[in-house]
């Protein structure tokens, strides 16, 4: 019987109660590997979850989060609320970044501004709650006579692509 069961492909299960050994998975269930004795129930993407990929007889459904939430955990096991840029999500809710920190994402915590002087540079554009400081040339490069005729355009820090 074990040898016969190993012949059952993905999308079926080994049904010991029927003369036909391999039975297709019932609706809303799947088996992703061969030789299974049961099919697994499909995941349902409800509430804050939305369906990214429908369940098939050989693969589980995949969920994503609705707008205003982001995934956490393997296979998006949890949805966590977004905050606005310039905020961080604490365990008590969204909170504005403190002075000297920023967050250019809708998730995560506030990050300290870059300290330009540590790399021997000067601040070209001040930081905000939503954007990091932009560092420019070293202070020595900005001494009279050393600066260029046209000052560099302020650079804006794009947000990083979430995973």
């Amino acid at each position: 019987l074990q040898d016969l069961c190993s012949n059952c492909p993905a999308g079926t299960f080994c049904d010991n109660n029927r003369s036909q050994i391999c039975s297709p998975c019932p609706p809303n269930s799947f088996s992703s590997a061969g030789g299974q004795r049961t099919c697994d129930i499909c995941r349902q993407c409800k509430g804050v979850f939305k369906t990214r990929k429908e369940c098939s007889s050989t693969s589980n459904a995949e969920c994503d989060c609705i707008s205003g939430y982001h995934c956490l955990g393997a296979e998006c096991s949890m949805c966590e609320q977004d905050c606005k840029q310039g905020q961080e999500l604490t365990k008590k809710g969204c909170k504005d970044c403190c002075f000297g920190t920023f967050n250019d994402q809708k998730r995560g915590i506030c990050r300290p501004w870059t300290n330009c002087s540590l790399d021997g540079k000067s601040v070209l554009v001040n930081g905000t709650k939503e954007r990091d400081v932009v560092c420019g040339p070293s202070p020595a490069d900005l001494s009279p006579g050393a600066s260029s005729a046209t000052p560099p355009a302020p650079a804006r820090e794009p947000g990083h692509s979430p995973q």
Epitope: K91, G100, G108, N115, D119, D132, P158, H160, P162
Partner: antibody
Framework: QVQLVQSGAEVKKPGASVKVSCKAS????????MHWVRQAPGQGLEWMGW????????NYAQKFQGRVTITRDTSISTAYMELSRLRSDDTAVYYC?????????????WGQGTLVTVSS | SYVLTQPPSVSVAPGETARITCGGD??????VHWYQKKPDQAPVLVVY???YRPSGIPERISGSNSGNTATLTLSRVEAGDEADYYC????????????FGGGTQLIILG
């Protein structure tokens, strides 16, 4: 798939400098901060600093400020960590590690490590 | 506080449950990450943001965090779980953004 490949082992004299490289592939290098972490023999993990490859903005642990410089070359998707005025207690394995797109989460991909030995 | 305190070692028999703690002032207000580190290998993220597992990490590894203690739990431990485990927290301070605990050696008995 995401990969971080670091330069080979180095042996340096006290007072010298070392520059370790970390070449990224399999993702948009400019979109993710890169961190450096080290582990000395018999010791724990120690965070050293990060760089935003997009802007070049950095932050360093206070312990290393003035001795460490993290840079990048976006044209070849490579981050560098240079440590100067080396001492024997800088002997360690140095790792680069990627932040997953936002600050406050775990470092999801790591380089294989680079052993730096400081010995006279 | 920027100090995360871990026990130097935890010993457990195969098949049993291991609990590794990470102590810090009000650590329950922070998001704690855990890494597994085996000799001559790079660290591997096993739990992030207190309790979430990256893809490929078995369900028997879990995390929790409240008050002054975060805990990494490994149930039904196997010989392959023997490693050092480090907790880690990010801060918004410019001088100490990244802090690791001292590490805990998980010893599998027998």
């Amino acid at each position: 798939q995401v990969q971080l490949v670091q330069s080979g082992a180095e042996v340096k004299k006290p007072g010298a400098s070392v520059k370790v490289s970390c070449k990224a592939s399999g993702y948009n290098f400019s979109g993710y901060y890169m961190h450096w972490v080290r582990q000395a023999p018999g010791q724990g993990l120690e965070w050293m600093g990060w760089i935003n490859p997009n802007s070049g903005g950095t932050n360093y642990a206070q312990k290393f400020q003035g001795r460490v410089t993290i840079t990048r070359d976006t044209s070849i998707s490579t981050a560098y960590m240079e440590l100067s005025r080396l001492r024997s207690d800088d002997t360690a394995v140095y790792y680069c590690a990627r932040e997953p797109g936002y600050y406050g989460s775990g470092l999801d991909y790591w380089g294989q490590g680079t052993l730096v030995t400081v010995s006279s | 506080s920027y100090v995360l305190t871990q026990p130097p070692s935890v010993s457990v028999a195969p098949g049993e449950t291991a609990r590794i703690t990470c102590g810090g002032d009000d650590i329950g207000d922070k998001r704690v990450h855990w890494y597994q580190k085996k000799p001559d290998q790079a660290p591997v993220l096993v739990v992030y943001e207190d309790r979430y597992r990256p893809s490929g990490i078995p369900e028997r590894i879990s995390g929790s965090n409240s008050g002054n203690t975060a805990t990494l739990t490994l149930s039904r431990v196997e010989a392959g779980d023997e490693a050092d485990y480090y907790c880690q927290v990010w801060y918004s301070s410019p001088d100490h953004p990244g802090v690791f605990g001292g590490g805990t050696q998980l010893i599998i008995l027998g």
